[in-house]
Interface confidence: low
């Protein structure tokens, strides 16, 4: 194929790949018709003058995962057709001025995962056709004004995983075509008003894992096309009332891992396209009426790991499309019977790790499609008659780690669990807490003769007599976890979490889909 270096492989499609630790310099001679060249995992430490001079047809050049620490300014001379250049995962600390001069066709420039300490306006001044610039994973502490002024066609800019402590409000002002801006994992403490005003086509803005404490009220007012906004793991303590008012296209918003104490009605919206809202790991204490009412298409709402002790009956008004609601690990003691009434499409509700003492009998009355209810680790002593009877799709119900009061009032619930155990496939059966003579016994195998009569005024309606046939062999093995479902998620169900740390967030948040900020 027009001469292929022995250290490389060359394909008929004019693709050349040179890999291996034995390579210490750019192999020669390279095929003159090469259109794609990859130099990967070598011990090349520097690029000298014009090593690619004879392959002027080159379109893509990947020099990745090498020991590259020095590049001569003329290294890429004569590559006027080059569209894609990656120098990622090397050891570059400095970029020579003029390095990219003459690369008039360059559209993608990847400089990520190096050790770059600074960039200057002159570095990219010749790259007028650049569409993608990846600078994440370097050691940049600031971006000088004008650094990107000539990159008017840029659509994707990644500055994540650097050491940026502040951003000039002018640094992005000429990037009117930018669609993706990533500034995650830096040290930003605030973003000046106007910083994003010029980004009228921005679709994704990633600001997660910084130290942002305050959001300017109009910070996103010019970003009408924004679809994904990541603000998680910052220090945001309050949201200005109008901060999200001009984001009609937003479909993903992450605010988890902040210090939010309250959410005012109307703070979110109108956002007719928002599908997911992530608010876990904040300090929210209550939810007022209509706080989410503008989010008509919301499907996932994660409010777990806050300090919520009160939910107003109309807090979830408008969420008619909601599929998943996570309220676990809060301070809830009571719920209004109508609080979930509007959630006609809800499939999964996580209420575990609260202080719920009782549930209203109508709590799930209009939520006929529920498939999973997590109620473990609350203060429940009993449940109202028929609370689950209409939930024909219910296939996961977790009731363990509650102080169940196993007197005669518990028998209907016990019978319901027995009759529905194969369908539910519960992993861990609920255990009686009182009276003392049955403490520690599994609720579903309480002997009808042992359970003592109720001596208290019931907090829930008393049950009609439920037929029960203790010796019926067709019941599942009631001494065991349901035999219809193998225990395939043991970590979540009973592993001592000091022994093994689960990294899948879903097992922590009680969710059903893999998501991240």
């Amino acid at each position: 194929y027009h001469g292929c270096p022995s250290e490389c492989t060359c394909s008929r499609a004019s693709q050349v790949e040179c890999t291996g630790a034995r390579i210490v310099a750019v192999p020669t001679p390279l095929p003159w018709n090469a259109m794609s060249l990859q130099i990967l995992n070598t011990h090349i430490t520097e690029l000298n003058e014009s090593p690619f001079l004879n392959i002027s047809a080159l379109i893509a050049l990947r020099i990745e995962k090498n020991e590259l620490s020095r590049i001569t300014p003329g290294a890429f001379r004569n590559l006027g057709s080059l569209r894609y250049l990656s120098l990622a995962n090397n050891k570059l600390q400095v970029l020579p001025i003029g390095l990219f001069q003459g690369l008039d066709s360059l559209e993608s420039l990847l400089l990520s995962s190096n050790q770059l300490l600074q960039i200057q306006p002159a570095h990219f001044s010749q790259c007028s056709n650049l569409k993608e610039l990846q600078l994440h994973g370097n050691h940049l502490e600031y971006i000088p004004d004008g650094a990107f002024d000539h990159l008017v066609g840029l659509t994707k800019l990644n500055l994540g995983k650097n050491s940026l402590t502040h951003i000039s409000p002018r640094v992005f002002q000429h990037l009117g075509n930018l669609q993706v801006l990533r500034l995650y994992e830096n040290r930003l403490t605030d973003i000046p008003m106007g910083t994003f005003d010029g980004l009228v086509n921005l679709q994704e803005l990633a600001l997660q894992q910084n130290q942002i404490g305050l959001l300017s009220p109009g910070l996103f007012h010019n970003n009408h096309n924004l679809q994904r906004l990541y603000l998680s793991n910052n220090h945001i303590s309050q949201l200005p009332p109008s901060v999200f008012m001009q984001l009609p296209q937003l479909n993903r918003l992450t605010l988890f891992g902040n210090s939010l104490k309250e959410l005012s009605p109307g703070i979110f919206g109108p956002m007719p396209n928002l599908r997911e809202l992530w608010l876990y790991d904040n300090h929210i204490s209550s939810l007022p009426d209509n706080v989410f009412s503008n989010l008509r298409q919301l499907q996932v709402l994660i409010l777990s790991r806050n300090q919520i002790s009160f939910i107003s009956p109309g807090a979830f008004n408008g969420l008619t499309e909601l599929r998943e609601l996570s309220l676990h690990t809060n301070a809830l003691q009571d719920l209004d019977g109508n609080v979930f009434r509007m959630l006609a499409n809800l499939q999964n509700i996580s209420l575990q790790n609260n202080r719920l003492r009782q549930l209203p009998g109508n709590i799930f009355a209009n939520v006929n499609g529920l498939m999973a209810i997590q109620l473990q680790n609350n203060q429940l002593e009993n449940l109202p008659l028929g609370i689950f009877d209409h939930l024909g799709k219910l296939c996961e119900l977790r009731l363990y780690d509650n102080p169940w009061r196993c007197d005669s009032d518990i028998l209907p619930l016990r019978n319901w669990l027995l009759l529905n155990q194969p369908r539910l496939g519960t992993d861990t059966v609920p255990v009686c807490f009182s009276p003392a003579n049955v403490r520690g016994q599994s609720l579903i195998i309480i002997n009808v003769n042992v359970a003592v009569p109720s001596v208290h005024v019931p907090e829930v309606p008393s049950y009609p007599e439920t037929p029960w046939y203790p010796d019926t062999p067709s019941y599942p093995d009631t001494t065991s976890v349901s035999s219809t479902t193998e225990l395939t998620s043991p970590v979540e169900d009973y592993t001592d979490l000091t022994t093994i740390q689960v990294t899948d967030d879903r097992s922590v948040w009680g969710m059903t889909q893999a998501q991240s900020g």
Epitope: T428, Q441, V481, L487, T488, S489, P490, V491, V502
Partner: antibody
Amino acid sequence: EVQLQQSGPELVKPGASVKMSCKASGYTFTSFVIHWVKQMPGQGLEWIAYIYNDGTKYNEKFRGRATLTSDKSSSTAYMELNSLTSEDSAVYYCARDFYFDYWGQGTTLTVSS
Amino acid sequence: DIVMTQSPDSLAVSLGERATINCRASESVDYYGISFMNWYQQKPGQPPKLLIYAASNQGSGVPDRFSGSGSGTDFTLTISSLQAEDVAVYYCQQSKEVPYTFGGGTKVEIK
């Protein structure tokens, strides 16, 4: 110090039943699973069942012949084996937690007429 | 049931040398991004002792010369420098799903 102390050796006749115990100390008994494992002389290890908060899960091979129970007040787990045959002669171990991080010293069961 | 196959059945290694034991599961034992594979050491007349849990995590008090690796269906226990007190039978075990199953064991001796 975490310890699992098992009951002493048993010599029983075929067809009889036996109940062995595993007393836990040094940790919160209710926070961990207790497993039971069988090891025949010169052979490998075979998982029988576990018990946790009165929920049990059995190896189908032992279902119906092994019964696990526990006494939280004394931090003791029990395994009863019935309809014994010579094939049940083995050392039976209890072990703690999902990763079997602590084991009892074993109870030797000999089934012989 | 998941079948665990250990190899070799026995292994004779000189003191100070590396010992490697392999274990293959009949299906993946990965879940939640974790490999539910554990390794145990059993000396004559003693109960088994946990060496490695979740494929590569050392049990409490286990010397650094013991390490585990692998994912999916193929796993390895390595003793980097065999000591006299390491003479024992070693078992792998999957704890992904019931019934939890053990390998047949590998007897390690001094050459």
